[in-house]
Amino acid sequence: CKAMHVAQPAVVLASSRGIASFVCEYASPGKATEVRVTVLRQADSQVTEVCAATYMMGNELTFLDDSICTGTSSGNQVNLTIQGLRAMDTGLYICKVELMYPPPYYLGIGNGTQIYVIDPEPCPDSDF
């Protein structure tokens, strides 16, 4: 089978600071030197791109400076962190992996990680 499979956790709870981390792992059918990782958010059948990065195998994963994502790569595993999340950002976050080079191209799409974000309660006013 030439398909590429992508695994990611089913559920992740964001921290009180609005940070969520999860691992995206792919089973590569070929020996890629250039890989693109994209995080997509699916809500109400609408799909939007959250962030994307292309990296050379063995090198670090670099997102754009203004990206809400950071990540590290190790072999066929990518550790992704999404920051600045609020309750309204709760949704299904899909990891998409593409083996860009050398040919042939392969596409892998995970089943998605449901990220739950709970906005922290505001601190009560203190008398002290």
Partner: antibody, heavy 118, light 108 residues
Framework: QVQLVESGGGVVQPGRSLRLSCTAS????????MDWVRQAPGKGLEWVAV????????YYADSVKGRFTISGDSSKNTLYLQMNSLRAEDTAVYYC???????????WGQGTLVTVSS | EIVLTQSPGTLSLSPGERATLSCRAS???????LAWYQQKPGQAPRLLIY???SRATGIPDRFSGSGSGTDFTLTISRLEPEDFAVYYC?????????FGHGTKVDIK
Amino acid sequence: QVQLVESGGGVVQPGRSLRLSCTASGFTFSSYGMDWVRQAPGKGLEWVAVIWYDGRNKYYADSVKGRFTISGDSSKNTLYLQMNSLRAEDTAVYYCARGGLLGGFDYWGQGTLVTVSS
Amino acid sequence: EIVLTQSPGTLSLSPGERATLSCRASQSVSSSYLAWYQQKPGQAPRLLIYGASSRATGIPDRFSGSGSGTDFTLTISRLEPEDFAVYYCQQYGTSPFTFGHGTKVDIK
């Protein structure tokens, strides 16, 4: 809304060249793969080429490899297909299409007809 | 390359009937990477289904996709007059991307 408009088709002699354009609007060009697909008269769909994201990675069908070149200009939101050494069997309607974020070609242009004939 | 074989070549049915179209791959295709398109004469194709079973935006629920491995099916539960067209399957999991030769659904 998303729109793709092809241009540049016409009648050309075998061995000559032609450049097709596809102007995109309504989305960020660099976030998507962009493809050319062709359809010979009365026949089915044939994938021709794709260009991804920053434009460094391009792939072609064997039938056009070495003769056709796909390129894009993100500042103009325009996709191109440079077709050289044209043959009679290249006669087709050429469509540009956007690769959907989860796969499949989710938007298509109206197509432009290329006729290769002496 | 992955070869997709569609059957039947032509399907003659009446409005209101159920249409079942088949697409068979020469090697296993992950269900995440199979799409179905509809094309009417003189028009560009339109994406119906991606990921073997997910309906594209604006596609009515009478269209459904299923299957895995090498065998995939597009089902139209009750044919409407506007559904008579040619349908293509496509795999996009690996290059070169390939289409089936199409199934024409015409009015009996």
